[in-house]
Interface confidence: low
């Protein structure tokens, strides 16, 4: 024999049983209809008929290509989403009776919205720009400008910026500076050797010239047998047109695109981004 709970011994319990109050709320997975609580249909099933005093809720499974993803009282199942190939869509995950189909974009395309209702082509990064982040099915390509020391000479949805070739590691010298769209052009070492040798030769010629001028000045002096008075240091006058006679601040020569460029003292010998481009 089933034992009644203590409160059911009280009159209140008896009165409730004799005059049941219509429920105003139902338990989880139930719904209120005609003043009574009926069971909801489980996911994957639709409602055929509500429960009565004597019968349970009647449910039927969803048909093929249909689904219901919650406990429900729907009389019709929802159609699975159609991944329309004409909109660039394909099935990422096939739907079941309890889940909808998930669409994504064809390779090379990405969704135009979070719901992925249609697709557009991935953007390509123009020359001078590289791919920072390759596009996915839901996000477009992210491009970035190639920084100094890097270049991209193609329009691509995949290529990153490539570093300039290092001529030094190949025992070559830079013949043409790189830009954000072009690689550096390397060439043989001969130019560098010439750059070192030519100033040395000029230096030697200059020294010889100095010696000749000095000898010439000394030779011009009258030969006096008298004892030499103490001589003041003699100032040497250089001809104005001699190389190196300019007494301006020292300068440094550098190569830019095969042309010697005068580098100001105190300015770093680095070619600016504008100059590179």
């Amino acid at each position: 024999m089933v034992r009644l709970p203590l409160q059911c011994v009280l009159w209140g319990c008896l009165l409730t049983a004799v005059h049941p109050e219509p429920p105003t709320a139902c338990r989880e997975k139930q719904y209120l209809i005609n003043s009574q609580c009926c069971s909801l249909c489980q996911p994957g099933q639709k409602l055929v008929s509500d429960c009565t005093e004597f019968t349970e809720t009647e449910c039927l499974p969803c048909g093929e290509s249909e689904f219901l993803d919650t406990w429900n009282r729907e009389t019709h199942c929802h159609q699975h989403k159609y991944c329309d190939p004409n909109l660039g869509l394909r099935v990422q995950q096939k739907g079941t009776s309890e889940t909808d189909t998930i669409c994504t974009c064809e390779e090379g395309w990405h969704c135009t919205s979070e719901a992925c209702e249609s697709c557009v082509l991935h953007r390509s990064c123009s020359p001078g720009f590289g791919v920072k982040q390759i596009a996915t099915g839901v996000s477009d390509t992210i491009c970035e400008p190639c920084p100094v020391g890097f270049f991209s000479n193609v329009s691509s949805a995949f290529e990153k910026c490539h570093p300039w070739t290092s001529c030094e590691t190949k025992d070559l010298v830079v013949q043409q500076a790189g830009t954000n769209k072009t690689d550096v052009v390397c060439g043989p070492q001969d130019r560098l050797r010439a750059l070192v040798v030519i100033p040395i030769i000029f230096g030697i010629l200059f020294a010889i010239l100095l010696v000749l001028v000095f000898i010439k000045k000394v030779a011009k002096k009258p030969t006096n047998k008298a004892p030499h008075p103490k001589q003041e240091p003699q100032e040497i006058n250089f001809p104005d047109d001699l190389p190196g006679s300019n007494t301006a601040a020292p300068v440094q020569e550098t190569l830019h695109g095969c042309q010697p460029v005068t580098q100001e003292d105190g300015k770093e010998s680095r070619i600016s981004v504008q100059e590179r481009q």
Partner: antibody, heavy 122, light 108 residues
């Protein structure tokens, strides 16, 4: 400059298979930007789209011809091909290959080959 | 399939005339409509795409308009080289892409 050139036999016997190839020059087919399609035109009549192929192997066909058509794309040779089975006299037409561009993925055929006449006759 | 109906099926006009060809879709195709010109023995050439956008290299006397189901191709001042057959084509609901039956434009 992109050019398309159809090639294949000009005469096919009824019930046999019509096979055509389209060679693409001036651009790589290994790109996600285009579909490569076949369109035909019976003598004195209008244009009928047969189907299209994508570089990754996806194909779309005209439902009216679907059971008889195969389109394949060979990016290594920069070619795509059409096979139409069980031909009849009604398949006699000029066959064009074309590059198709969005909108709507297989949208506008905007570059065409010059066409090749195929006659179905015994 | 979406049916495309062109009118008229043929028309005669003179050089300098303004000519209009219409195309009607059996259901709404938004603005996914293209127009082609075909000369005898040649492949069709795309003139207008997306209802009103002029294809690169096409003379500006050609223009397209319309959206939904009704579209028009207009040639503002007919030139001798414009005598040809014109086709409309929908790319909204595909496959298949479908063409109109064509409009033959002849010299009067």
């Amino acid at each position: 400059q992109l050019q398309l050139q159809e090639s294949g036999p000009g005469l096919v016997r009824p019930s046999e298979t019509l096979s055509l190839t389209c060679s693409v020059s001036g651009a790589s087919m290994n790109t996600n930007n285009y579909y490569w399609g076949w369109i035909r035109q019976p003598p004195g009549k209008g244009l009928e789209w047969i189907g299209s192929g994508y570089y990754n192997g996806n194909t779309y066909y005209n439902p009216s011809l679907k059971s008889r058509v195969t389109i394949s794309v060979d990016t290594s040779k920069n070619q795509f091909s059409l096979k139409l089975n069980s031909v009849t006299a009604a398949d006699t037409a000029v066959y064009y290959c074309a590059r198709q561009t969005p909108p709507r993925i297989i949208g506008s055929p905007n570059i065409w080959g010059q066409g090749t006449m195929v006659t179905v006759s015994s | 399939d979406i049916q495309m109906t062109q009118s008229p099926s043929s028309l005669s006009a003179s050089v300098g005339d303004r000519v209009t060809i219409t195309c009607r879709a059996s259901q709404s195709i938004s603005s996914y409509l293209n127009w082609y010109q075909q000369k005898p023995g040649k492949a069709p050439k795309l003139l207008i795409y997306a209802a009103s956008s002029l294809q690169s290299g096409v003379p500006s006397r050609f223009s397209g308009s319309g959206s939904g189901t009704d579209f028009t191709l207009t040639i503002s001042s007919l030139q001798p080289e414009d005598f040809a057959t014109y086709y409309c084509q929908q790319s909204y609901s595909t496959p298949p892409i479908t063409f109109g039956q064509g409009t033959r434009l002849e010299i009067k």
